[in-house]
């Protein structure tokens, strides 16, 4: 029993960020005369939250009218709570002293915990594109959540991934936390339309997790396959040689025809066709006048895809015998080869 007790009935209070926290406090007596003050934390570094005597505290309102006679309810409300407001709050009775007020009695304290939602997960992939069969790393980051407990999962096209590492920082007590996770993904040729999803579940989200996505179309490079073929044309002494550029991604592609090593024509892929898997096909042709050549002609289709080293496929066109009629394939021999 004491001549005055300061009662803080709530050991802890949990509030969602953005809401209002009510911190309850009553005194058992109004004597001795002196103000009530609220502090966050204890000791010399404590932070003044509210002073009944003086000061301007725009975020704080008193639950009851402290100017009312015999009022012993010194509860306060703190508006627009953020994670930075977390801590232990003490209701402290001061008595008039000479010259300064003297701390008389403190409540036991109320721990304010702030539930803060994690930010939308941001997924980022590698800086440079990678080709199928390579393993690439994706990172996922989310910040500003509290309490610390959080669950993070990775998915590729709805299938949960298992090869990832996650850290929540800081390790110790903090007003809010951040999560950082790195997942490893093996690319396949079919991944142009694939998505990598980072899913974050937290108590503040009420069972509706946040998701961040990355499209593998930003990450993958599918190199083209080349096929050079020859078709006769109606006009005598002319051969149509086509270069089929298949299954490439992204679209950025430049093709150069070489006749016996000399550049004949360069063009950029424009009218491409898209495959179901998101890759592209493109075809280029070269009309070769056989009569203009005495010797065999080596035709090379050279493709530079997405700034990578050129890939080429060659076709030997023998000019010893000229095609006489449409459909005849005797005038040229296809001896294609891939060159890098």
């Amino acid at each position: 029993e004491e001549e005055l007790q300061v009662i803080q009935p709530d050991k802890s209070v949990l509030v969602a960020a953005g809401e209002t926290a009510t911190l309850r406090c009553t005194a058992t007596s109004l004597i001795p005369v002196g103000p009530i003050q609220w502090f966050r934390g204890a000791g010399p570094g404590r932070e003044l939250i509210y002073n009944q005597k003086e000061g301007h505290f725009p975020r704080v309102t008193t639950v009851s009218d402290l100017t009312k006679r015999n009022n012993m309810d010194f509860s306060i409300r703190i508006g627009n709570i953020t994670p930075a407001d977390a801590g232990t709050y003490y209701c402290v009775k001061f008595r008039k002293g000479s010259p300064d007020d003297v701390e008389f009695k403190s409540g036991a304290g109320t721990e304010l915990s702030v539930r803060a939602k994690p930010s939308a997960p941001v997924v980022s992939g590698p800086a440079a594109r990678a080709t199928p069969q390579h393993t690439v790393s994706f990172t996922c980051e989310s910040h500003g959540f509290s309490p610390r407990d959080i669950t993070l999962k990775w998915f590729k096209n709805g299938n949960e991934l298992s090869d990832f590492q996650t850290n929540v920082d800081p390790v110790g007590e903090s007003v809010s936390y951040s999560i950082h996770s790195t997942a490893k993904v093996v690319l396949t040729r079919e991944d142009v339309h694939s998505q990598v999803i980072c899913e974050v579940a937290h108590v503040t989200l009420q069972g509706d997790p946040l998701r961040g996505t990355a499209n593998l179309s930003e990450t993958i490079r599918v190199p083209p396959t080349l096929e050079v073929t020859q078709q006769p044309v109606r006009a005598e002494n002319q051969v149509n040689v086509t270069c089929q550029v298949r299954k490439f991604y992204p679209q950025r592609l430049q093709l150069t025809w070489l006749e016996n090593g000399n550049v004949s024509r360069t063009e950029t892929a424009s009218t491409v066709t898209e495959n179901k898997d998101g890759t592209y096909n493109w075809m280029s042709w070269l009309l070769v006048n056989v009569s203009a050549h005495r010797d065999d002609v080596k035709l090379t289709c050279q493709v530079e895809h997405d700034g990578q080293p050129a890939v080429s496929k060659s076709h030997d066109l023998k000019v010893s015998a000229h095609p006489k009629e449409q459909g005849s394939n005797t005038a040229a021999e296809n001896t294609g080869s891939n060159e890098r």
Partner: antibody, heavy 114, light 111 residues
């Protein structure tokens, strides 16, 4: 129940120090303050000072240079010392509990005389 | 120091009548919404007995015939109806500012 009892010499010589004890029961001296109040014969009440539960003290400025209030919590006793007494210090001395002065002792009469 | 002036210095009242004692402070004794003025009854040979605290609150065990009112600098103790054993000295006291002070007292006699 709450009780306070004052004790000490009934006669003190001028210029000497008056020493009184207030022995309390029914409450803790760590939880409650104790006041000293005096009443000269046929006159009104005068507050001397208080010792709070935490041991801090506040005194009447008119007596501050001469008065000391202390306590021994383990013995449930509060002490008043008033130095350099004169005949004007002749009075009945009371101890009373807390800032509210809700319980009083019966008082002890001190006469200052040679 | 806050000086408390009580009036009248004495009064005689018949049983069943109303007795009114006033206490005027030299400065306000109000703080934080409350008036730190209290009233005590003292009978001969006895210590003061608390009657009213914080201007208007009845101490436990005190009959409802006693009531207190006022704020700031002007306060009143009312006994209604007066009974024979209410004969005593009545003191107001403030503990809003140091030094805590008492009024000079009012002697109530029963006719």
């Amino acid at each position: 129940q709450v009780q306070l009892q004052e004790s000490g010499p009934g006669l003190v010589k001028p210029s000497q120090t008056l020493s009184l004890t207030c022995t309390v029961s029914g409450f803790s001296l760590t939880g409650y303050g104790v006041n000293w109040i005096r009443q000269p014969p046929g006159k009104g009440l005068e507050w001397i000072g208080i010792i709070w539960g935490d041991g801090s003290t506040d005194y009447n400025s008119a007596l501050k240079s001469r008065v000391t209030i202390s306590k021994d919590t383990s013995k449930n006793q509060v002490f008043l010392k008033l130095s350099s007494v004169t005949a004007d210090d002749t009075a009945r001395y009371y101890c009373a509990r807390a800032g509210k002065m809700d319980y009083w002792g019966q008082g002890t009469t001190v006469t200052v005389s040679s | 120091d806050i000086v408390l002036t009580q009036s009248p210095a004495s009064l005689a009242v018949s049983p069943g009548q109303r007795a009114t004692i006033t206490c005027r402070a030299s400065e306000s004794v109000d703080s934080y919404g409350n008036s730190f003025m209290h009233w005590y009854q003292q009978k001969p040979g006895q210590p003061p007995k608390p009657l009213i605290y914080l201007a208007s609150n009845l101490e436990s065990g005190v009959p409802a015939r006693f009531s207190g009112s006022g704020s700031g600098t002007d306060f009143t103790l009312t006994i209604n109806p007066v009974e024979a054993n209410d004969a005593a000295n009545y003191y107001c006291q403030q503990n809003n500012e140091y030094p805590w002070t008492f009024g000079g007292g009012t002697k109530v006699e029963i006719k």
